[in-house]
């Protein structure tokens, strides 16, 4: 048993049929010695008396808020949560496996630049009685500070019969140098509590590996005289690290017909313009990627040809 | 500790070209190592990230773009002094800091070159003959060093009398390639910045 936060404790349980329960001794936080009684949750029934209450925690029915009282007055609370371990593996019932980039990916993180700011998100089908708490650091043995905000519900989607909820959190490394060469990964730890179930999820990464630039901005077409060709121009996204001559991007320009089946013409360039043939009803899209370290491509920025 | 914005100089172009080749070569070599050594811990998640140049050179700090010198998190490093002549420099126009930056890059390359050559000698003794260093990568390191053209003491190649542990050598190769790739990215960024300045 360990303390998650004040008056909230996590009991780690081996979750197999013939596992014994965990013996837990609850102590009432009071100088009083006599006349103390214990109740659980909303029930007013007395579960025991005395300054300590020894319980066996085996089921979710044994978890909950234990309260000690004296003469109708509440003295203290202890909320017990359960963390299940099945076949030596901690349960992952609360979050959905996103399976990208590999199986058992519950947390996904992205950074728009090298400033040390990043966003992580996760999915669940649970809509109520759900809380998240996020901590992060650079390295684990001698951790350096990363500050994370509160996790918030960022999207709701319907998937078949199920509703899916996306939560996200923004974090910022306390003292980040965009030009630094990372040798210690960022560690992100999410505590998830659903009703009386506790789970924790972790992700470890280098900022350089989760970079995904914003799409190029100000995408414009300039027709070339007496030609079907157009000059496409764009700019670096505002969110990209500066100076751009140091943090350079490379670009992919794509001409795509109305039909998804039509052949796509693609051009790669380090410049912020390109000359392409604009077909009728086609659209021109441009996306960006770090020129020197191949992490993710940005989403496409698009304009119609006509 | 910063790179001044100078007028463009054609003398920078050869270094930019060589640094691009270097990044391409080390990335290819790392990819090959990952594939060939698929049953070894060779991915970024599996290896320990070690920097053989740590406390010996200060490339990131010495080559910091001017715009980032206002960022205190980028300035917590030590001073290192280097020899200041090199053919990538437009001699009179180049500041002391740029010289320091380029000589730091040169020292990095020299250290990696020695390590890679020593390692290759060991890998050539492996009866499995599983993996060797790409000669192209070694050549590209050499070319960039020549383009930088710093006078520097030659570092003798390390020789070892004991029987090599090939498993450890291959893991060390992965660690070295990952670190060198990260340094090659920094070198490429620096050359691009200097080229645009």
């Amino acid at each position: 048993i360990w303390e998650l936060k004040k008056d909230v404790y996590v009991v780690e349980l081996d979750w197999y049929p013939d596992a014994p329960g965990e013996m837990v001794v609850l102590t009432c936080d009071t100088p009083e010695e006599d006349g103390i009684t214990w109740t659980l949750d909303q029930s007013s029934e007395v579960l025991g008396s005395g300054k300590t209450l020894t319980i066996q925690v085996k089921e979710f029915g044994d978890a909950g808020q234990y309260t000690c009282h004296k003469g109708g007055e509440v003295l203290s609370h202890s909320l017990l949560l359960l963390h299940k371990k099945e076949d030596g593996i901690w349960s992952t019932d609360i979050l959905k496996d996103q399976k990208e980039p590999k199986n058992k990916t519950f947390l996904r993180c992205e950074a728009k630049n090298y400033s040390g700011r990043f966003t992580c998100w996760w999915l669940t089908t649970i809509s109520t009685d759900l809380t998240f708490s996020v901590k992060s650091s650079r390295g684990s043995s001698d951790p350096q500070g990363v500050t994370c905000g509160a996790a918030t519900l960022s999207a709701e989607r319907v998937r078949g019969d199920n509703k899916e909820y996306e939560y996200s959190v923004e974090c910022q490394e306390d003292s980040a140098c965009p030009a630094a060469e990372e040798s210690l990964p960022i560690e992100v730890m999410v505590d998830a509590v659903h009703k009386l179930k506790y789970e924790n999820y972790t992700s470890s990464f280098f900022i350089r590996d989760i970079i995904k630039p914003d799409p190029p901005k100000n995408l414009q077409l300039k027709p070339l005289k007496n030609s079907r060709q157009v000059e496409v121009s764009w700019e670096y996204p505002d969110t990209w690290s500066t100076p751009h001559s140091y943090f350079s991007l490379t670009f992919c320009v794509q001409v795509q017909g109305k039909s998804k089946r039509e052949k796509k013409d693609r051009v790669f360039t380090d410049k912020t313009s390109a000359t392409v043939i604009c077909r009728k009803n086609a659209s021109i899209s441009v996306r960006a990627q770090d020129r020197y370290y191949s992490s993710s491509w940005s989403e496409w920025a698009s304009v119609p040809c006509s | 500790r910063n790179l001044p914005v100078a007028t463009p100089d054609p003398g920078m172009f050869p270094c930019l070209h060589h640094s691009q080749n270097l990044l391409r070569a080390v990335s290819n070599m790392l990819q090959k190592a990952r594939q060939t050594l698929e049953f070894y811990p060779c991915t970024s998640e599996e290896i320990d990230h070690e920097d053989i140049t740590k406390d010996k050179t200060s490339t990131v700090e010495a080559c910091l773009p001017l715009e980032l010198t206002k960022n205190e998190s980028c300035l917590n490093s030590r001073e290192t002094s280097f020899i200041t002549n090199g053919s990538c420099l437009a001699s009179r126009k180049t500041s002391f800091m740029m010289a320091l930056c380029l000589s730091s890059i040169y020292e990095d390359l020299k250290m990696y070159q020695v390590e890679f050559k020593t390692m290759n000698a060991k890998l050539l003794m492996d009866p499995k003959r599983q993996i060797f260093l790409d000669q192209n990568m070694l050549a590209v390191i050499d070319e960039l060093m020549q383009a930088l053209n710093f006078n520097s003491e030659t570092v003798p190649q390390k020789s070892s009398l004991e029987e090599p542990d090939f498993y450890k050598t291959k893991i060390k190769l992965c660690i070295l390639l990952h670190a060198f790739r990260i340094r090659a990215v920094t070198i490429d960024r620096v050359m691009s910045y200097l080229n645009a300045s």
Epitope: P17, D18, A19, P20, G21, M23, L40, D41, Q42, S43, S44, E45, L47, G48, L53, T54, I55, Q56, V57, K58, E59, F60, G61, D62, G64, Y66, K195 | -
Partner: antibody
Framework: EVQLVQSGAEVKKPGESLKISCQSS????????IGWVRQMPGQGLEWIGI????????RYNPMFRGQVTMSVDKSSSTAYLQWSSLKASDTAMYYC????????????WGQGTMVTVSS | EIVLTQSPATLSASPGERATISCRAS??????LAWYQQKPGQAPRSLIY???NLQSGIPARFSGSGSGTDFTLTISSLEPEDFAVYYC?????????FGQGTRLEIK
């Protein structure tokens, strides 16, 4: 006052289905799991299983798994035990009981439902 | 599963006497053992939990002791209403199991 009131005695033929009930009152129904115990004529007590009234989480005795089904209706504070196809060997007194949280034993019992299966 | 063996199977005693019933487990159940009393035609009633804790409303003449594999239920001075069948139950490991019962009868 805590009370567990069970449905009346049943006489059934082999192969028939049956659902007996246990209605709780006088306490916070969702705080306490409900269990079932079998007592064959002239025999001792046998633990069938327990279930959570919150999310219908169930722990069956392997000996009874597939033979009986436990269920619960939170809105009426009622627990059920059912059979899809009765056998003569199911003849017994069935007790529902309230599981004490933080312990696991049964602190309050229903009066029992006698189930007789005979052709 | 854990087997609980009660002894004796039948205990003959007179009102006012001390009665002791034993319950032995096939493996340790820590202190997670309960005792129940069942009278003819009635449902069982909880007497003792966690080996030695008296259930609310049960007379103090009933007491329990033991831990691990050996447990004892003691009735310090028998009253006429105490003659019944007594069962021990372990609730440490699933499936929870009962002893076969001890019949306490009037001598």
């Amino acid at each position: 006052e805590v009370q567990l009131v069970q449905s009346g005695a049943e006489v059934k033929k082999p192969g028939e289905s049956l659902k007996i009930s246990c209605q709780s009152s006088g306490y916070s129904f969702t705080t306490y799991w409900i269990g079932w115990v079998r007592q064959m004529p002239g025999q001792g007590l046998e633990w069938i299983g327990i279930m959570s009234p919150v999310d219908s989480d169930i722990r069956y005795n392997p000996m009874f798994r597939g033979q009986v089904t436990m269920s619960v209706d939170k809105s009426s504070s009622t627990a059920y035990l059912q059979w899809s196809s009765l056998k003569a060997s199911d003849t017994a007194m069935y007790y529902c009981a309230r599981r004490r949280p933080g312990q696991g034993y049964f602190d309050f019992w229903g009066q029992g439902t006698m189930v007789t299966v005979s052709s | 599963e854990i087997v609980l063996t009660q002894s004796p199977a039948t205990l003959s005693a007179s009102p006012g006497e001390r009665a002791t019933i034993s319950c032995r487990a096939s493996q340790s159940v820590s202190s997670w053992l309960a005792w129940y009393q069942q009278k003819p035609g009635q449902a069982p009633r909880s007497l003792i939990y966690a080996a030695s804790n008296l259930q609310s409303g049960i007379p103090a003449r009933f007491s329990g002791s033991g831990s691990g594999t050996d447990f004892t239920l003691t009735i310090s001075s028998l009253e006429p209403e105490d003659f019944a069948v007594y069962y021990c139950q372990q609730y440490n490991i699933y499936p929870f199991t009962f002893g076969q019962g001890t019949r306490l009868e009037i001598k």
